[in-house]
Interface confidence: medium
């Protein structure tokens, strides 16, 4: 279907009879078929061979006999000013002008909204020469018009460095309403007001808006576009959309879900990644966030020991990463661990509790009553001690570590010895004579090495001295050591 804008067939005084045809597509002799590649050069009919077109720069023949005549001012004829049509229809419109033959080098160009139309537009210029004037008809056709074709179209003719401009032809492509703003999905607080916006445009205007909530119309009477719907509050999830109506029909926006913010679901899959004597590294999978971002999480730790007072330790941590190292735990203890996370609405329930254990720790006390003396041979130092009173959490004693440091003029040398758990004495070889030997002992379990005892010093004389008196630490193990020589 072609919407064709025709000018009235009024004969121009200098042109015999009306313009040929009325630019309908069945007049193939007018070659009004659309061209599909590039901006078209002027199409000219040769006066000597009617109906046989040739293309090229138009040079209208001079007419010398008319040189002395006073010529009327050149102007495009009035044509239709406003064409209204529906989207996807075809349209064809034209402008026409009669030019005395004394002019040459005429070109017609089409302009839309102030910009020249270059490229693949369907523009055809046809020439109908006569003795004194040439009628020029410039046609412009658009197939399957879109909204983007809306605008003001004009013809311009350059003739002898003068520019002649036609009246505008305003093309208005009408269609269903087109949304320029649609409602957006939102997460809202229960019973709290919020706004949704919907805006649609024509042409044709006006565009009326109906709001729809869960498939039911909110407003019985339409509102003008744009429309803001203020919802006073929801208690449950709802889906909103808007309908835009104009004279061409109805367009429906996307449906948007409005979610009600709630407390999060509890975390799941709490896992133990690493356990030491005093810390446990855990991770978890966050639950559903309740349509509101997580703010932080809380790790809850209960000691399972029946003798414990059942108090809960709480460690707050950021919501991400979903991992936390619980510190300051007792060694070789059993714990129950749960995780809860919060958003702006509140705290989730606690995750399923999981059991975790710390490993055994190192001893917390040093061996007692450390005594050091030089044996008769003067080649060995005898060391004796008492087993420390270790707590259960330290685990089973596996042995002792003995540190002995030898100091003489300009020399300091530390050596370490390990002995089994059943020993309470050891013998070490004299490393240096005329030197001080400083001895410290620590208990060892699978959990690690405990603290060293306070140092005990003994002087190893040069060969020939006689002294077998011991050095020792008092029973508590924390008084200043006594050196007896």
């Amino acid at each position: 279907a072609i919407t064709e804008a025709r000018e009235e067939a009024k004969p121009y005084p200098l042109f015999p009879g009306p313009l040929p045809g009325s630019l309908q597509t069945d007049h193939t002799s007018l070659l009004s078929l659309p061209h599909t590649s590039g901006y078209q050069p002027a199409l000219m009919f040769s006066p000597t061979q009617p109906g046989r077109p040739y293309t090229g720069n138009v040079a209208i023949p001079r007419v010398t006999s008319a040189g002395s005549k006073l010529l009327p001012p050149l102007a495009f004829k009035h044509t239709v000013g406003h064409i209204i049509l529906s989207e996807h229809k075809d349209v064809k419109f034209n402008c026409s002008i009669s030019v005395p033959n004394i002019y040459q080098d005429t070109t017609i160009s089409w302009w839309k909204d102030g910009k020249e139309l270059l490229g693949a537009h369907h523009a055809i210029t046809q020439f109908y020469p006569d003795d004194e004037v040439t009628a020029i008809i410039a046609s412009f056709s658009i197939t399957s018009v879109q909204r983007s074709d809306n605008g003001s179209y004009i013809c311009k003719m350059k003739i002898n460095n003068e520019e002649i401009v036609s009246d505008p032809i305003y093309i208005e492509v009408q269609g269903l309403p087109h949304f320029t703003k649609q409602p957006e999905s939102m997460n809202v607080t229960r019973n709290t007001a919020f706004n949704l916006t919907c805006q649609a445009v024509g042409p044709p205007e006006p565009v009326n808006i109906f709001w729809v909530q869960n498939s039911s119309r909110v407003n019985e009477q339409p509102e003008k576009s744009p429309s803001v719907l203020t919802v006073p509050g929801l208690t449950e999830m709802a889906v909103f959309s808007c309908e835009a109506h104009n004279d061409k029909g109805l367009t429906v926006s996307k449906g948007v879900q409005i979610n009600i913010k709630a407390i999060p679901s509890p975390p799941t899959e709490v896992s133990i990644h690493n356990s030491t004597a005093h810390s446990i590294l855990i991770s978890w999978v966050p639950g559903f966030d309740g349509y509101s971002p997580f703010r932080n999480c809380s790790v809850q730790v209960k000691e399972v020991d029946p003798l414990s007072n059942g108090s809960v330790m709480i460690f707050n941590t950021s919501a991400s990463p979903h991992m936390y190292q619980i510190k300051q735990l007792q060694a070789l203890a059993n714990y129950s661990i749960g995780v809860s996370c919060m958003n702006e609405i509140g705290w989730s329930a606690v995750s399923p509790w999981i059991l975790a254990s710390t490993t055994e720790g190192a001893p917390s006390v040093a061996p007692l009553n450390v005594t050091v003396f030089l044996n008769e041979s003067r080649d060995n130092v005898d060391i004796r001690w008492m087993k420390p009173l270790t707590k259960r959490q330290a685990g089973e004693l596996v042995g002792y570590r003995i540190s002995h440091v030898w100091q003489s003029a300009g020399i300091s040398k530390e050596l370490l010895e390990e002995v089994g758990q059943n020993n309470s004495r050891a013998q070490i070889s004299v490393q240096v004579h005329n030197a001080t030997c400083t001895v410290r002992i620590a208990a060892v379990t699978k959990g690690g090495v405990g603290p060293f005892s306070d140092p005990v010093k003994i002087f190893i004389p040069a060969h020939g001295w006689v002294d077998h008196a011991p050095s020792s630490t008092p029973a508590p193990g924390n008084a200043d050591p006594v050196l007896i020589i």
Epitope: P206, V218, N219, E220, E223, K224, P226, S227, T230, P232
Partner: antibody, heavy 123, light 107 residues
Framework: QVQLQQSGPELVKPGASVKISCKAS????????MNWVKQRPGKGLEWIGR????????NYNGKFKGKATLTADKSSNTAYMQLNSLTSEDSAVYFC????????????????WGQGTTLTVSS | QIVLTQSPAIMSASPGVKVTMTCSAS?????MHWYQQKPGSSPRLLIY???NLASGVPVRFSGSGSGTSYSLTISRMEAEDAATYYC??????????FGGGTKLEIK
Amino acid sequence: QVQLQQSGPELVKPGASVKISCKASDYEFSRSWMNWVKQRPGKGLEWIGRIYPGDGDTNYNGKFKGKATLTADKSSNTAYMQLNSLTSEDSAVYFCARKGGYYYSISNYFDYWGQGTTLTVSS
Amino acid sequence: QIVLTQSPAIMSASPGVKVTMTCSASSSVSYMHWYQQKPGSSPRLLIYDTSNLASGVPVRFSGSGSGTSYSLTISRMEAEDAATYYCQQWSSYPPYTFGGGTKLEIK
């Protein structure tokens, strides 16, 4: 300052018609609904209907359909209400009132009111 | 059509006291608006969208409510507050009905 200036009091005979005007100033007349409200002596308020001057769209309270006709003239920023087949029941003060808020909000409250036009229907 | 019932129909209050009047809707409405009208004058918007104070209205006026139950409160009554107060509903369905009014007198 937004103003709504209504026409003066009317005394008309039963069966006749009357046209009341409401001239708006200092806002974009064509983009806000104009409402009409009736108040009988000593009584409460009744919403008659509304008109969107931009395109002449109207909504009526079912009770007033056929009784009231709302029109608007954008060029003079004036809204009109014509009342037909008048009876003593139509004797009242009639107010025009602008829809408040954003011109595109669908909440319907009235932020500016005309001073009222007193209509007396009496033979 | 939604019916609005205002109570009490008439009340009186001494200056400085707190005054509360209610508006009950026959079915749930989205918002309630409140107007003040003095004899011989046009109504004046006081509260819109349930709880928003209209321009130029003293802060001693406040509104609240949801669903079918709404109220207008004057925190400290003043002589100039003697008037009739109307509630008006917006449920998105015209007609936009008004309540019958509460006449507030000064003691």
